[in-house]
């Protein structure tokens, strides 16, 4: 059985998806899609997070121990690469 991703009335086969993981345009809210060796990465626009940038970021999540290293994080709000 093929997995099919429905987007804009278009069905995308598993083969197509593996050839171009960004074909289904999975990144929401203006996130940019980049091919990755194990699939794809959504680089989220500022204010969004999640594997597909589907979540709005809410404050206070950064309070953690130990502090995370700085730098761009896929699936998190960031400047476009």
């Amino acid at each position: 059985d093929h997995h099919h991703h429905h987007h804009e009335q278009k069905l995308i086969s598993e083969e197509d998806l593996r050839a171009d993981p960004c074909a289904a345009r999975p990144c929401a809210h203006g996130g940019r899609c980049y091919a990755h060796f194990s699939g794809l990465v959504c680089a989220c626009a500022p204010g969004y997070m999640g594997a597909r940038c589907e979540f709005p970021v809410h404050p206070d999540g950064a309070s953690a121990l130990p502090a995370a290293p700085p730098g761009l994080r896929p699936g998190d709000p960031q400047r476009y690469l």
Epitope: D1, H3, H4, H5, H6, H7, E14, L17, R18, P21, P26, A28, H36, F37, S38, G39, L40, V41, M49, G50, A51, R52, E54, F55, P56, V57, H58, D60, G61, A62, S63, A64, A68, R73, P74, G75, D76, P77
Partner: antibody, heavy 124, light 107 residues
Framework: QVQLVQSGAEVKKPGASVKVSCKAS????????VHWVRQAPGQGLEWMVI????????SYAQKFLGRVTMTRDTSTNTVYMELKSLRSEDTAVYYC?????????????????WGQGTTVTVSS | DIQMTQSPSAMSASVGDRVTITCRAS??????LVWFQQKPGKAPKRLIY???SLYSGVPSRFSGSGSGTEFTLTISSLQPEDFATYYC?????????FGQGTKLEIK
Amino acid sequence: QVQLVQSGAEVKKPGASVKVSCKASGYTFTSYYVHWVRQAPGQGLEWMVIINPGGGTTSYAQKFLGRVTMTRDTSTNTVYMELKSLRSEDTAVYYCARGEAVTGNYFYYGMDVWGQGTTVTVSS
Amino acid sequence: DIQMTQSPSAMSASVGDRVTITCRASQGISNYLVWFQQKPGKAPKRLIYAVSSLYSGVPSRFSGSGSGTEFTLTISSLQPEDFATYYCLQHDSYPYTFGQGTKLEIK
């Protein structure tokens, strides 16, 4: 194997706070999102919050904004969910669940591995 | 928020029966639809992701189908261990939402 182990049951008074922990093992902790979902007695499942254990960013369901705080400790691979100003309707089983990989997805699984649940009882 | 409506909310069936549970989304959710099984006192257990893909270890009597806003979970031949409550989950958009559940009881 991939596992999420949660802290034990809690009994709290109205107005108090509760902090529930979820310790991950069997995978790279910072590579997957973690969700919290709750279930009141005899009721359905309710999504609460997601955290990126690597960056610490969070997103809350609207009804929990300001009352739930998520933290994580990357040295012990543990996520914490604190719920403040408890009321009787917060009596529920609280589950953590592993979400999507932060990087590298062909397909999306929603939530694939769940903790055993933590019962929180709010009673005066 | 996207509302997920499951039907029926409860049903009784016998071992060997074919059972279908439906989940309707209030708007299109692409293929971001997951099914879970939950037994009393236990955490939900994953069954199906991406509408129709079985997680490894899930018996082939379980299947999923649908697209857009209407989705179904089918159990082709009920086994005693299948009596449980079933939930759908949309993970297309924030906030994630579950169906209210379908309790499958022994007739």
